[in-house]
């Protein structure tokens, strides 16, 4: 059910492209294609290519993305395109100018001098942004989200975008300076992962991150469980980055117990993050237990 045909506007197309990209990434990383048949991988890649080609129709002259060509470009959507395309680089041919042009736009047009990334044209499909929705720590959460995307594009775009390392440092400085007084577990988790990627989740910041976990196994706020799955997935990625393998098993167990297999309305971020995190876990964790995750591969009829 994760392999779907992407379609629609610049936002809907990314909603459709997400589960296919992450499912292929997950099965590649965990070497599980034999279970489904390698021929299905080719079918899934065709769908990713289709999604990529369709997304280019929503690329603006500035290299940013929006739901429609005539709509003001969105910081969040552009960062999300960067994130998904960065992951898809190993799967299909992606023009680095498309990817790095978007990175350049984020840095030159949307980053303020204090490192914060601002959103001037929020997405229409608010359900696709996950825990960033109605977040009262928006500067921190959005900056962390964009920073993670930039770091995932770093190896691809460093040579083309000279300002990338400085932009990453500035955004990291902002997160670091404001981390200790965060209230929401979601923001602690997403900003924690962004800082961990930079090697900056240390000392008191690490204590803040670890002690925010409920029962040492989940990063949870009141409200939508989908957001808690997303937040805990970011936290798991941070723990793996930190090589904190003592803390990891209960977190993986909790994520597994949610029996969350992705798909469905409003699940874009939770789906992407849980499969990214669990793929990373199976790759990184020594002697990990096998995870029985239900990834069904029914290719859509043409």
């Amino acid at each position: 059910h994760l392999i779907v045909t992407p379609s629609g506007c610049g936002e809907q197309n990314m909603i459709g492209m997400t589960p296919t990209v992450i499912a292929v990434h997950y099965l590649d990383e965990t070497e599980q294609w034999e279970k489904f048949g390698l021929e299905k991988r080719q079918g899934a890649l065709e769908l990713i290519k289709k999604g990529y080609t369709q997304q280019l129709a929503f690329r603006q002259p500035s290299s940013a993305f929006a739901a429609f060509v005539k709509r003001a470009p969105s910081t969040w959507l552009t960062a999300y395109v960067v994130k998904v395309f960065s992951l898809a680089v190993n799967l299909i041919a992606i023009d680095s100018q498309v990817l790095c042009g978007a990175v350049k736009w984020l840095i030159l047009e949307k980053q303020k001098p204090d490192g914060v990334f601002q959103e001037d044209a929020p997405v229409i499909h608010q359900e696709m942004i996950g825990g960033l929705r109605n977040n009262n720590e928006k500067d921190m959460a959005l900056t962390a989200f964009v920073l993670i995307s930039l770091q995932e594009a770093k190896d691809i775009c460093e040579e083309q975008v000279n300002s990338l390392p400085g932009s990453i440092t500035k955004a990291g400085d902002f997160l670091e300076a404001n981390y200790m007084n965060l209230q929401r577990s979601y923001t602690v988790a997403i900003a924690g992962y962004a800082l961990a990627q930079m090697g900056r989740l240390k000392g008191p910041l690490l204590n803040k991150f670890l002690t925010t976990a409920k029962d040492k196994n989940r990063w949870e706020d009141p409200g939508k469980q989908l957001y808690n799955v997303e937040a805990t997935s970011y936290a798991l990625l941070a723990l793996l980055q930190l090589k904190d393998f003592d803390f990891v098993p209960p977190v993986v167990r909790w994520l597994n117990e949610q029996r969350y297999y992705g798909g469905g309305y409003g699940s874009t971020q939770a789906t992407f993050m849980v499969f990214q995190a669990l793929a990373q876990y199976q790759k990184d964790a020594p002697d990990h237990q096998e995870l029985n995750l239900d990834v069904s591969l029914q290719l859509p009829s043409r």
Epitope: A177, N181, Q183, G203, P204, T212, K214
Partner: antibody, heavy 119, light 113 residues
Framework: QVQLQQSGAELVRPGTSVKVSCKAS????????IEWIKQRPGQGLEWIGV????????NYNEKFKGKATLTADKSSNTAYMHLSSLTSEDSAVYFC????????????WGQGTSVTVSS | DIVMTQSPSSLAMSVGQKVTMSCKSS????????????LAWYQQKPGQCPKVLVY???TRESGVPDRFIGSGSGTDFTLTISSVQAEDLADYFC?????????FGSGTKLEIK
């Protein structure tokens, strides 16, 4: 302004337990970590552990696991440290402290609570 | 755990003199990703709680007189009082907050002649 007010001095018997309190005011209690530090007479400082009052999550120095238990009551903006199975080694001044700036150094401290373990 | 070693354990100085105290860590406190040393210096006057003087090895806490100067990087750190005053009579502790558990030096006691 930020203040941490600790409970008064305690004289307790060996083998018993004690609970030290730290009442916070002047800031959003649930947003900031509370650290606990031990200082024995004429000696240095030892980090016991930390509590996140918002989640109740804790992290301890291995040395104090089983000795100290940290809790927090959001309704009264108070953090607590429970010390069990007391011996003369536990006689010390105990401080609570918090980070309010982004220096990562503990910039606000309670006045300290003296615990004396004696028969 | 990171071990913090302070020296000297005590020193007596006259008002106006320059004071230097040392703190060494058993491993580097420099985070290469932000070029910051995770070290603080505290002053504890008799019967009081500790007070931050310097953080990130060399940044003076606001309100702290500029005669207090923190320096050093990696494993070797120094706190200098450029011209000691009578009110500086206190114990001085260094603390690393690079890794958990946080650890303190055993302190330097400053006495005024």
């Amino acid at each position: 302004q930020v203040q941490l007010q600790q409970s008064g001095a305690e004289l307790v018997r060996p083998g018993t337990s004690v609970k030290v309190s730290c009442k916070a005011s002047g800031y959003a209690f649930t947003n900031y970590l509370i650290e606990w530090i031990k200082q024995r007479p004429g000696q240095g400082l030892e980090w016991i552990g930390v509590i996140n009052p918002g989640s109740g999550g804790t992290n301890y120095n291995e040395k104090f696991k089983g000795k100290a238990t940290l809790t927090a009551d959001k309704s009264s903006n108070t953090a607590y440290m429970h010390l069990s199975s007391l011996t003369s080694e536990d006689s010390a001044v105990y401080f609570c402290a918090t980070y309010y700036s982004n220096s990562f150094a503990m910039d606000y401290w309670g006045q300290g609570t003296s615990v004396t373990v004696s028969s | 755990d990171i071990v913090m070693t302070q020296s000297p354990s005590s020193l007596a100085m006259s008002v106006g003199q320059k004071v230097t105290m040392s703190c060494k860590s058993s491993q580097s406190l420099l985070n290469s990703s932000n070029q910051k040393n995770y070290l603080a210096w505290y002053q504890q006057k008799p019967g009081q709680c500790p007070k931050v003087l310097v953080y990130f090895a060399s940044t003076r806490e606001s309100g702290v007189p500029d005669r207090f100067i923190g320096s050093g990087s990696g494993t070797d750190f120094t706190l200098t009082i450029s011209s000691v005053q009578a009110e500086d009579l206190a114990d001085y502790f260094c603390q690393q907050y690079y890794s958990i558990p946080f650890t303190f030096g055993s302190g330097t006691k400053l006495e005024i002649k």
